[in-house]
């Protein structure tokens, strides 16, 4: 079920106009310290680095793009779900 949701989000993200994808600064894609429990297990960046990235939405980290994306709560839109629908 979650996999379907992930695929759905990835389709939306990949089909979005470039400005619609909330992508962080390029330098944030550089070397990262490997944190997390267990060998080679990385924590979801949405839980720390991008914890407050989405204003009225939920953060979803798209591994393929190495960038966070926001799923907006009802009535909100924009790359960080900051805009209110009229």
């Amino acid at each position: 079920d979650l996999q379907e949701a992930d695929l759905d989000l990835l389709r939306v993200t990949l089909s979005s106009k470039p400005q619609a994808l909330a992508t962080p600064n390029k330098e944030e894609h550089g070397k990262r310290k490997k944190k997390g429990k267990g060998l080679g297990k990385k924590r979801d960046p949405c839980l720390r680095k991008y914890k407050d990235f989405c204003i009225h939405g939920e953060c979803k980290y798209v591994k393929e793009l190495r960038a966070p994306s926001c799923i907006c709560h009802p009535g909100y839109h924009g790359e960080r779900c900051h805009g209110l629908s009229l």
Partner: antibody, heavy 122, light 113 residues
Amino acid sequence: QVQLQQSGTELARPGASVKLSCKASGYTFRTYGITWVKQRTGQGLEWIGEIFPGSGNTYYNEKFKGKASLTADKSSSTAYMQLSSLTSEDSAVYFCARESFSDGYYGYFDYWGQGTTLTVSS
Amino acid sequence: DIVMSQSPSSLAVSVGEKVTMSCKSSQSLLYSTNQKNSLAWYQQKPGQSPKLLIYWASTRESGVPDRFTGSGSGTDFTLTISSVKAEDLAVYYCQQYYRYPLTFGAGTKLELK
């Protein structure tokens, strides 16, 4: 499989408070919203409010502000709704439901709990 | 608040009949960002929890029989059951998720003639 297990029937006195629970399983709790809906006997569905466990954001129907308080415990994948200053008007079945998303937006409820019946009587 | 109006309030049908019910919103539910209508349909049988049938006005939820079809745009929406079965007797609710507060219609009760 996705399941929402709600707490059992509640009987409460006028003026008291109750805390209803909704335990989620079968999916990543923080990825979806949990919404609460009221249904009085023989009546329609009334949206109370919702919580997004991931961000902690809550949204309320103005009518239920001060009446309902929504919280979520990520460690146990459980959402709660506290109802205060109970009156007979609060007697109803309360449903929790998972708020799902597609195309980048949340908004519709794809899995529902079995409902908790609350009776307020002296 | 967005007001959702459903009609008729009740509908008496025979098994095998085609049925349509209406849901109207007090303002457009069309999201300009994705050109989709933020409307869902639910079925509730007596003593049961509601069940999602349709979202984005016309997308059928997984596992829902294809006799259920959602259509419409803007403020006018329709749920059609192409050939009613006895198990379809229930109350049907529409719900908007265009903006808060989320609101439901009063429901259409499908009864046996």
